[in-house]
Amino acid sequence: EPTMYGEILSPNYPQAYPSEVEKSWDIEVPEGYGIHLYFTHLDIELSENCAYDSVQIISGDTEEGRLCGQRSSNNPHSPIVEEFQVPYNKLQVIFKSDFSNEERFTGFAAYYVATDINECTDFVDVPCSHFCNNFIGGYFCSCPPEYFLHDDMKNCGVNCSGDVFTALIGEIASPNYPKPYPENSRCEYQIRLEKGFQVVVTLRREDFDVEAADSAGNCLDSLVFVAGDRQFGPYCGHGFPGPLNIETKSNALDIIFQTDLTGQKKGWKLRYHGDPMPCPKEDTPNSVWEPAKAKYVFRDVVQITCLDGFEVVEGRVGATSFYSTCQSNGKWSNSKLKCQPVDCGIPESIENGKVEDPESTLFGSVIRYTCEEPYYYMENGGGGEYHCAGNGSWVNEVLGPELPKCVPVCGVPREPFEEKQRIIGGSDADIKNFPWQVFFDNPWAGGALINEYWVLTAAHVVEGNREPTMYVGSTSVQTSRLAKSKMLTPEHVFIHPGWKLLEVPEGRTNFDNDIALVRLKDPVKMGPTVSPICLPGTSSDYNLMDGDLGLISGWGRTEKRDRAVRLKAARLPVAPLRKCKEVKVEKPTADAEAYVFTPNMICAGGEKGMDSCKGDSGGAFAVQDPNDKTKFYAAGLVSWGPQCGTYGLYTRVKNYVDWIMKTMQENSTPRED
């Protein structure tokens, strides 16, 4: 607890002080006071620098004195033998004695009192900026007229802050301009204009004279302009060193004028005005601005239109133009919007074809569709090349945005059939020789695939079973092989309207119009073992002549067994219809004369016992296309015969092409159109 006075005595005083003692006293008087410490008695063993025994006076980190020996007063009217005056309110006294004293020393007696200090004069650093007033225990600062004391109670300044300028034009000057500005002041001026206008400050060089910078280049007095996060300055010196025209790009400007205690000059004067906020004429690639102007300011509106092949993407919506407004902050609205190249996106995939992954899907990019060759070809032309058009669509020169269509190649076996002599009298065949061959398992029969969705067969095959199970792609009809091949599911069976349905089909003698179509539920995927046969053309080129050769195939009866396990085939010549009429029916169910022969029938066979037989019904009689030797077309369908191993009768497909096309067209799916 601070005290105003006190006494300090060495140990055992006035008796001799003991050896090996170290004792300290912490003196503290109230703040605002100094300490007067005086000794009235001093008797301590003398040594050089008081190294043996001593009394030490410390103020803060400073040693004020170190005493030893004997002292007597120089003034007969005063008992004081040594005294110390410190302007601080704390002092430490330390007494030390060593291990031996040659004589008897009595030590010391000392007293301290709190003394007033003159803060205004006693310190190097003057506490007040202007007037200092001392009183016992303290001081206070005061200011000249028109100055006020700052909150720190030490510094005086002029009251030059708080002015807010809102007019679109104005003039501001430092206090007393052109007389010297006040020292030790911070003047803040605020310019606040309507949003959309920027503050433009203009100065003349000669209207500026502020105390110059120090040797380190730091302004002692300074003028600073602050506009948002941008700062201009600090400026100082004789003549304005900054730009004479400052475009702040802001409607709010703070002017800060800071002065120190020394070196007052005449100060400064400036003019300001509000400019409509300019917006930069931005270079927006791939677009045109409307209207085109040299300068755009607050509230100007432009329409930015993208060039062809470019679009503005906002969210998921693409547009070709947008509006932008020059805003109050000097920035364009919608500035994030850009004219980007139109993106046509990942091209749609097509059935039975592919499109290479494009390097780019942007405007001008090119892609190529191809069909899965050699089993499919591009039906609707156009070459398959599409480019990304300005409207965001992939476009072909011929088809426009319509996608190419890959349709099965017909009539081309992967491997040609080679007779290995030995169907009746025929040879072993591979399904790759007859990829159009369809197997019906109930009844055991055949058919011909004519496109992805349709199978052609004989009417008598399907008349008793309108939901036949069919298989494609297998040479063998062992159950194990068929299980691994492609099973076709019928959607509907269409029997030719001219086919006469009988209650007892076994007794049939009229096989006229023995033709039917089976519409499939799902499209067939073509490949080396599955691919359609062509239909005949309607021109006379497709009229068969006697002796024309055709191929038949199937799993019907052979000389060796009632059903073939592996596909058999034979090459047969077309014969005159009378040759078939002349053959005696093997197991007639009626009078021989009752059997009907019509122009809708083809007679073929008669050579080397090669013929179709029970179980081959519905299979194609395949003839080389007269206009394209690489292809086969279905000239006939295995229909009936008087006797296996002689001549057989085949439905003449050419006579039914119109019915086939009409039936398929009327019963196609939208996906096929």
Partner: antibody, heavy 125, light 107 residues
């Protein structure tokens, strides 16, 4: 050459078990169904069991149902007959035979076109 | 189960004779029937399948006929190597059943 060779026969006590095997060669084993047929000494032929090409369908004679199990391992070209709870009346020469199965959903069987030489099973106490 | 009744159970014939063996099914089996020949100490051998189809490699003197419930195996001219036991087999449905057999002996 198409060949079927049976093995695994032998003498076993009533109630005992045996496993017969039939090794096939000279044809694609997994394209055919297979059958077991037995012939008791001096008696006629009796069909025992049959299995289709992939092992998903089996059939048994009433006399062996619940005691015998037919199976196949197509990877090993082998047919098996596991015989449990054997009785004296199971004593016979056991043949394996090949069955041809044609067609899809509606199929046509041609049974037992190729036979093995047989393996003898004797059940006696 | 379908019962197959074969007759006669045995017959004596001479070389060159025409021999007929009959098999009767207890219910209709369409033409799902085969004929087998077995010689003593040998495995059976298929002669006919699907009632009337001659197995490849089998002499043409053997023939089969019939449908439904009545079936016949005919040997048009008996040869010395034809003396054996003949079985019919129905495969219309499980369980498959053989006829009791017909033993053809030399007269």
């Amino acid at each position: 050459e198409v060949q079927l060779v049976e093995s695994g026969g032998g003498v076993v006590r009533p109630g005992g078990s045996l496993r017969l095997s039939c090794a096939a060669s000279g044809f694609t084993f997994d394209d055919y169904g297979m059958s077991w047929v037995r012939q008791a000494p001096g008696k006629g032929l009796e069909w025992v069991s049959g299995i289709n090409w992939e092992g998903g369908s089996t059939g048994y004679a009433d006399s062996v149902k619940g005691r015998f199990t037919i199976s196949r391992d197509n990877a090993k070209n082998s047919l098996y007959l596991q015989m449990n709870s054997l009785r004296a009346e199971d004593t016979a020469l056991y043949y394996c035979a090949r069955d041809e199965q044609l067609g899809g959903i509606k199929y046509y069987y041609y049974y037992m076109d190729v036979w093995g030489k047989g393996t003898t099973v004797t059940v006696s106490s | 189960d379908i019962q197959m009744t074969q007759s006669p159970s045995s017959l004596s014939a001479s070389v060159g004779d025409r021999v007929t063996i009959t098999c009767r099914a207890s219910q209709g089996i369409r033409n799902d029937l085969g004929w087998y020949q077995q010689k003593p100490g040998k495995a059976p051998k298929r002669l006919i399948y699907t009632a009337s189809n001659l197995q490849s490699g089998v002499p043409s003197r053997f023939s089969g006929s019939g449908s439904g419930t009545e079936f016949t195996l005919t040997i048009s001219s008996l040869q010395p190597e034809d003396f054996a036991t003949y079985y019919c087999l129905q495969y219309k449905q499980y369980p498959l059943t053989f006829g009791g057999g017909t033993k053809v002996e030399i007269k």
